[in-house]
């Protein structure tokens, strides 16, 4: 029997300081260019090294990122968004939702005392 | 990956000009913002133009506002670098680099992902 993949989602509070080498990450998604079907939203697809996202070490790419200096991203357009954060100056406070991947055991009794899970 | 080449370098006098070329292949050409840097024998890595991808806006270093011009042709994927009133330290490799969706102002080199190999201009 197959396991189930279920997500465990956070959110989280993010304040980078775009340093001499930038907040060095690169976004995805917008209304024009959905990166997820049916979610207009925006999502971090790569992190560059040597950014201050790497060097704080909390954004993930596959990130959500729901807010920019409290300004919501919804229904923006992908280079509206890209705007955004090219104008968002040196002290960048960002809202992000972290999908974490929870894989569960196979559906079924699991026995007392079984360690796996 | 883009694959990007540069050509039209040279060497030209003081004053003349020189148009540089980049030609992209690899992805959509039109979405990506294309930039051109420069480095010259001793020195750091300097921004010199930048055009970005969706709306076509320029941006240029002070030290050369004026005296070129970064435009692109889609239809070719190509960014082009017209050079006018070329001055001794204009000399230089000028660098040809492309990016996407950076959140990164395009005068930095982080904005971008991929990079020619350079092509050789000369101030007499």
């Known amino acids: 029997m197959n396991g189930r993949v279920d997500y465990l989602v956070t959110e989280e509070e993010i304040n980078l300081t775009r340093g001499p080498s930038g907040l060095g990450f690169n976004i995805v998604g917008g209304t024009d260019q959905q990166y997820v079907s049916n979610d207009s939203g925006i999502y971090v697809s790569r992190i560059k090294e040597n950014g201050a996202a790497a060097l704080d070490g909390r954004l993930q790419e596959g990130d959500k990122i729901l807010s920019v200096n409290g300004q919501d991203l919804k229904n923006l357009l992908h280079q509206d968004a890209v705007d955004l954060f090219r104008n968002a100056g040196y002290a960048v406070s960002l809202r992000v939702q972290h999908r974490l991947q929870v894989q569960n055991g196979p559906i079924g009794h699991r026995g007392e005392g079984d360690p796996s899970g | 990956q883009v694959q990007l080449v540069e050509s039209g370098g040279g060497l030209v006098q003081a004053g003349g000009s020189l148009r540089l070329s980049c030609a992209a292949s690899?992805?959509?050409?039109?979405?990506?913002?294309m930039g051109w840097f420069r480095r010259a024998p001793g020195k750091e890595r300097e921004f010199v133009a930048a055009?970005?991808?969706?709306?076509?806006?320029?941006d240029y270093s002070d030290s050369v506002k004026g005296r070129f011009t970064i435009s692109r042709d889609n239809a070719k994927n190509t960014v082009y670098l017209q050079m006018n009133r070329l001055k001794p330290e204009d000399a230089a490799v000028y660098y040809c680099?492309?990016?996407?969706?950076?959140?990164?102002?395009?005068?930095?080199?982080?904005?971008?992902?991929?990079w020619g190999q350079g092509t050789q201009v000369t101030v007499s």
């Open positions: 680099a492309a990016g996407f969706g950076s959140v990164d102002g395009l005068e930095y080199p982080i904005s971008y992902d991929d």
């Open positions: 690899g992805r959509s050409f039109s979405s990506l913002d």
């Open positions: 055009i970005s991808g969706s709306r076509g806006s320029t």
